[in-house]
């Protein structure tokens, strides 16, 4: 959805939900060319990019949340995989760089899109939960209560280690919208039923 | 009334150091991540340099980026900026400025009216 | 990084008359539906004052004679009326990556 605007139609709400993050638990939209930009697309490099535990909800704790609980928690894990998602842009090779050691300049632009991708999932969360009269959840265009604040590794000089941690990360992010897929594909046909 | 107020700039050497302060008053500081942008004299506008709101996450400008420090005191609603290895090209009016909008897309919609800083020997 | 270029550098308009300044991106400054552009005026001696956010809102404040367009790579900020009050200098941001850069400015004065 473009800035601001909040469609009032539950089930057309809950389509894009569900197609936005179908798209974004698809490993190669971001963790794959995140790993092949990196240098990481090693199978013993490969092995060390693994979750971190507790860097996001898992689906359990999403499932016991309730609609309104659940929205807010994603709204404000989206705002901080904002954050990382700008942290590792910082860090990415320059289009330069990469088309001179022979990368596909197609994996870069792919990791420019999550962001803003994200951002309109997490729009399309607001509206949702405006939809579900939730009026404790920031407007996404205002500044909020403060994102708040998450397992942040701790800043690394080290290189390769921060490429782990960013790898470790994606593939986290992944899994988690995998999980928030499968909480919205059991809500029900309208606002006030859930298929639990 | 919003406001942001620079100090600690002045005259420093190539090679010196510099700390900038920003003082905010008007706004709940800790809601809102901020920013250094820059004016050298007679020229435009370069951001250099933003935190989050809670400090956790930073971003800079390529030119800046290891001898420059953004950080931020919540709880005394203040903005700094640790300046390191100062060279002639960083003189230039730094402004602080408030961050609005959506998180990492920013804009500034509130800005200080500046503290210059001069690199020269 | 992208590059901001900002056009004309001046631009004299008698006063009443529509003033147009445009900005163009080295790439797109667009996605997902949101155009990450931002428009900035400057007095002399003054600190910058945003006029136009996310390429057509308008800040709160500012006189509606003041309006945004564009998507992609172009975008336009539009004085339908200019008023003598609006002498001063221009500057479109990006914040679609970092870094945020601003174009190189447009000085708009009276004819």
């Known amino acids: 959805a473009a800035m601001g605007s909040c469609s009032k139609e539950y089930r057309m709400l809950l389509g894009q939900l569900q197609k936005q993050t179908d798209l974004m638990q698809d490993t190669s939209r971001l963790l794959d060319p995140y790993i092949r930009i990196q240098g990481l697309d090693i199978p013993k490099l490969r092995e060390h990019c693994r979750e971190s535990p507790g860097a996001f909800p898992s689906e359990e704790t999403l499932r016991g949340l309730g609609r309104r609980g659940f929205l807010q928690t994603l709204n404000a894990t989206l705002g901080r995989v904002l954050h990382r998602l700008a942290d590792l842009e910082q860090h990415l090779p320059k289009a330069q760089d990469l088309e001179r050691s022979g990368l596909n300049i197609e994996d870069l632009e792919k990791l420019q899109m999550a962001r803003p991708n994200v951002l309109g999932l997490r729009n399309n969360v607001y509206c949702m939960a405006q939809l579900l009269d939730n009026s404790d959840m920031t407007e996404p265009t205002k500044a909020g209560r403060g994102t708040p604040q998450p397992p942040t590794p701790t800043p690394t000089s080290d290189v390769f280690q921060r490429k782990l941690e960013g790898c470790s990360f994606l593939r986290g992010y992944h899994r988690f919208m995998h999980s928030v897929g499968r909480v919205f594909s059991k809500w029900g046909e309208s606002p006030n039923r859930s298929r639990r | 009334e919003v406001q942001l107020v620079e100090s600690g700039g002045g005259l420093v050497q190539p090679g010196g150091s510099l700390r900038l302060s920003c003082a905010a008053s008007?706004?709940?500081?800790?809601?809102?991540?901020m920013s250094w942008v820059r004016q050298a004299p007679g020229k435009g506008l370069e951001w250099v340099a933003t935190?989050?709101?809670?400090?956790?996450?930073?971003y800079y400008l390529d030119n800046v980026r290891g001898r420059f420090t953004i950080s931020r005191d919540n709880a005394k609603n203040s903005l700094y900026l640790q300046m390191n290895s100062l060279r002639a090209e960083d003189t230039a009016v730094y402004y602080c400025?408030?961050?609005?909008?959506?998180?990492?897309?920013?804009?500034?919609?509130?800005w200080g009216s500046g503290t210059l800083v001069t690199v020269s020997s | 990084d992208i590059v901001m270029t900002q056009s004309p550098d001046s631009l004299a308009v008698s006063l009443g008359e529509r003033a147009t300044i445009n900005c163009r991106a080295s790439?797109?400054?667009?996605?997902?539906?949101?155009?990450?552009m931002h428009w900035y005026q400057q007095k002399p001696g003054q600190p910058p004052k945003v006029l136009i956010y996310?390429?057509?809102n308008l800040e709160s404040g500012v006189p509606d004679r003041f309006s945004g367009s564009g998507s992609g790579t172009d975008f336009t900020l539009t004085i339908s009326s200019l008023q003598a009050e609006d002498v001063a200098v221009y500057y479109c941001l990006h914040s679609r990556e970092f870094p945020f850069t601003f174009g190189g400015g447009t000085k708009v004065e009276i004819k």
């Open positions: 400025a408030r961050d609005v909008g959506h998180t990492t897309f920013w804009y500034f919609d509130v």
């Open positions: 790439k797109s400054v667009s996605a997902a539906g949101y155009n990450f």
């Open positions: 996310y390429a057509s």
């Open positions: 008007g706004f709940t500081f800790s809601n809102y991540a």
């Open positions: 935190i989050s709101d809670g400090g956790s996450f930073t």
